[in-house]
């Protein structure tokens, strides 16, 4: 969470941004809020990126002005125009690229004053893992797969029954480069699993952490997955 202040004569406005992460190839949002101003035509929003000449996006007089927009953002950005009057200056970003990572500035000017705040935008790839029983194996085993990760994550297994056990010697993890030559598919196989136990496959890099759980009993298989972004907020 970054809060910036600006001074315009005696007036300053608070601008707030949140560090966030973008998933390569998906659409993302760079969050920014400011003190609302009902005079829409008096609001100017400028998004800038450190090291880039030109603007990422500009919104003024109630509409976009992309005349100064840098080429790398062409056709990829939009503000939530109907939410600007209530203080939302967040930026939608289409088809997030690795090169979109960096420090952004959300600059606001209204009839009340002006202000700005920086935002650190991380980019990578992260996806939910899916665990299945691998019936092809000679012994009972579990296969954990996640289609898109970058940078290369670490993979670890855990079990409810054998808490604290190290499964590195009874598991095998591979990383397969996807067709776009950036992200990778993660596959990890855990061998010699026992029935009536809950196993967890944990995949983590510096952007996200994902966990897949599987409980195998005589009568059923229960699965659960979750993903959380790290250092956001």
């Amino acid at each position: 969470l970054i809060i910036g202040f600006g001074i315009s004569g005696k007036h300053f406005i608070t601008v707030t941004t949140f560090t966030s992460a973008g998933n390569i190839g998906e659409d993302g949002t760079l969050s920014c809020t400011f003190e609302p101003d009902i005079k829409l035509n008096g609001i100017v929003i400028q998004w800038l990126k450190e090291g880039i000449k030109g603007l990422v996006h500009e919104f003024k007089e109630g509409k976009d002005d992309l005349s100064q927009q840098h080429e790398m953002f062409r056709g990829r950005t939009a503000v939530f125009a109907d939410q600007v009057v209530v203080g939302n200056a967040s930026l939608r970003l289409k088809n997030v690229q690795l090169t979109d990572a960096g420090t952004y500035t959300c600059y606001i000017r209204t009839s009340k004053g002006k202000g700005n705040a920086n935002l650190e935008y991380k980019t990578g790839a992260f996806s939910m893992p899916e665990i299945n029983v691998d019936y092809n194996a000679s012994s009972e085993s579990l296969r954990c797969e996640a289609p898109r990760w970058f940078p290369q994550p670490t993979v670890a297994w855990a079990s409810q029954v054998d808490q604290g056990a190290n499964f590195s010697e009874v598991s095998n993890t591979s990383f397969e480069l996807n067709s776009e030559n950036v992200t990778m598919k993660v596959v990890s196989v855990l061998y010699n699993v026992t029935i009536n136990n809950t196993y967890s496959c944990m995949i983590e890099n510096d952007i996200a952490k994902a966990t897949g759980d599987i409980k195998v009993t005589d009568s059923e298989v229960k699965r659960r997955s979750q993903l959380q972004l790290l250092n956001s907020g």
Partner: antibody
Framework: QLQLQESGPGLVKPSETLSLTCTVS??????????WGWIRQPPGKGLEWIGN???????YYNPSLRSRVTISVDTSKNQFSLKLSSVTAADTAVYYC????????????WGQGTLVTVSS | EIVMTQSPATLSVSPGERATLSCRAS??????LAWYQQKPGQAPRLLIY???TRATGIPARFSGSGSGTEFTLTISSLQSEDFAVYYC?????????FGGGTKVEIK
């Protein structure tokens, strides 16, 4: 409501330059949230995006046509234009102009289209 | 470039029936997809953008769904004016590309 109208010669000789103009009425070409694009459709075939322009003059072209395409804008006349050089019979198509959202980038509305035939 | 593939090429449907058109992208386009309707001798008309948002003035019988690489346009109850060619278009990355079209004809 916004309307677009293509104009230009319907017949162009091989190796010459195809020139079309799109006139925008019912709204300003300087509207900030839009690009202005060209799309073509050979007879009985599908649609191909040619490129777009912003009112400030910045352009983006389809790489398959980039070496032959020029799109320009005249804000005083509320018009934008397409030039396609060194044409061949394969460039025979109905050429459409359209307003293109800055993002989302859908095309709406479209001009009614003009058929350009490349033949000697 | 991203290749868009539509199926079937031709769909024969009786008036009042449901029509389901498919569009597949060669790689993920997230929800950055639009659908257009084109009648003979006319320009295409925008129906859907953002994969599922109906354009202004488009009847509720038209609906879009899907994300990533698989998309569907559904016409819940075909009217006589709906017989036309339908195109999908991705705007996820340049160059923007269209599918080859699906012709919906009267059965």
């Amino acid at each position: 409501q916004l309307q677009l109208q293509e104009s230009g010669p319907g017949l162009v000789k091989p190796s010459e330059t195809l020139s079309l103009t799109c006139t925008v009425s019912g709204g300003s070409i300087k509207s900030g949230s839009y690009y202005w694009g060209w799309i073509r459709q050979p007879p009985g075939k599908g649609l191909e995006w040619i490129g777009n322009i912003y009112y400030s003059g910045s352009t983006y072209y389809n790489p398959s046509l980039r070496s032959r395409v020029t799109i320009s804008v005249d804000t005083s006349k509320n018009q934008f234009s397409l030039k396609l050089s060194s044409v061949t019979a394969a460039d025979t198509a109905v050429y459409y102009c359209a307003r293109e959202g800055s993002y989302p980038n859908q095309f709406d509305p479209w001009g009614q289209g003009t058929l350009v035939t490349v033949s000697s | 470039e991203i290749v868009m593939t539509q199926s079937p090429a031709t769909l024969s449907v009786s008036p009042g029936e449901r029509a389901t058109l498919s569009c597949r992208a060669s790689q993920s386009v997230s929800s950055n997809l639009a659908w257009y309707q084109q009648k003979p001798g006319q320009a295409p008309r925008l129906l859907i953008y953002g994969a599922s948002t109906r354009a202004t003035g488009i009847p509720a019988r038209f609906s879009g769904s899907g994300s990533g690489t698989e998309f569907t346009l559904t016409i819940s109850s075909l009217q006589s004016e709906d017989f036309a060619v339908y195109y999908c278009q991705q705007y996820h990355s340049f160059p923007f590309t269209f599918g080859g079209g699906t012709k919906v004809e009267i059965k």
